[in-house]
């Protein structure tokens, strides 16, 4: 449902994050220290352009644990 | 108190444009996303369309893509919404409503809407 | 697009009585649903979202219930401002689509 060209919005958009960021949290806006470039939120990148896994996941709220 | 005040009715003929504002007053314009909701005489209601204020991206309807636009002046904290080629059947109230949060909450704040004749 | 589906289109009900109304989604959009209420010449006022959640303001006699793709809009006694068209909208992804309206008349 988050390939490249996809849009999602709205509790979709919600749902998602809690999916692909588990139990981290997530950012709507990603906190300016971790934006590699300006950041719109992700509202904005993934609802009126198109997200990815990638991009969601630079959204949550902390780095996923290397096992 | 937070409020959204729309222009005036509107009669138009059919293959016209119109073009409706609204303003935003007693929170922060660009926090909030906004929404257009058009309601047909006696009918449900429809949306149309909705529009980030922060950077002016928009979002339309499949319906209304290519006839509608929605663009926005943040110096005035107002929203307008064009719709071109006009036909009968847009003969409606249209509403700007502020979106809630995160596009997923529904619409708390509505303008009192405004009439939009299409007629001959 | 996701539908909505409202049921019943209306009824007529007496001032104390419980009032149900129900809507479904053609799939399944979690709790992402919207009621609203909206008077004769009036802009429709939010008077639940995600489902259950009532807003500041609104009577606790207003209740909302469902999830996936069942809901229901419950008022526990109803009084003579609540007649009015209460409309469900789902927000779970665009786009945004309502129900065709719940007409509360006065028996």
């Known amino acids: 449902a988050y390939g490249p060209g996809e849009t999602l919005c709205g509790g979709e958009l919600v749902d998602t994050l809690q999916f692909v960021c588990s139990d981290r949290g997530f950012y709507f806006s990603r906190p300016s220290s971790r934006a590699n470039r300006r950041s719109r939120g992700i509202v904005e990148e993934c609802c009126f352009r198109s997200c990815d896994l990638a991009l969601l996941e630079t959204y949550c709220a902390t780095p996923a644990k290397s096992e | 108190q937070v409020q959204l005040v729309q222009s005036g009715a509107e009669v138009k003929k059919p293959g016209a444009s119109v073009k409706v504002s609204c303003k935003a007053s007693g929170y922060t314009f660009t926090s909030y996303y906004m929404h257009w909701v058009r309601q047909a005489p006696g009918q449900g209601l429809e949306w149309m369309g909705i529009i980030n204020p922060s950077g002016g991206s928009t979002s339309y309807a499949q319906k209304f893509q290519g006839r509608v636009t929605m663009t926005r002046d943040t110096s005035t904290s107002t929203v307008y919404m064009e719709l071109s080629r006009l036909r009968s059947d847009d003969t409606a109230v249209y509403y700007c409503?502020?979106?809630?949060?995160?596009?997923?909450?529904?619409?708390?704040?509505w303008g009192q809407g405004t009439t939009v004749t299409v007629s001959s | 697009d996701i539908q909505m589906t409202q049921s019943p289109s209306s009824l007529s009900a007496s001032v104390g009585d419980r009032v149900t109304i129900t809507c479904r989604a053609s799939q399944s959009i979690s709790s992402y649903l919207n009621w609203y209420q909206q008077k004769p010449g009036r802009a429709p006022d939010l008077l639940i979202n995600?489902?259950?959640s009532l807003q500041s303001g609104v009577p606790s006699r207003f209740s909302g219930s469902g999830s996936g793709t069942d809901f229901t809009l419950t008022i526990s006694s109803l009084q003579p401002e609540d007649f009015a068209t209460y409309f469900c909208?789902?927000?779970?992804?665009?786009?945004?689509?309502f129900g065709g309206g719940t007409k509360v008349e006065i028996k």
């Open positions: 409503a502020r979106d809630v949060q995160w596009l997923a909450y529904g619409m708390d704040v």
């Open positions: 909208q789902q927000s779970y992804s665009l786009p945004f689509t």
């Open positions: 995600a489902a259950s």
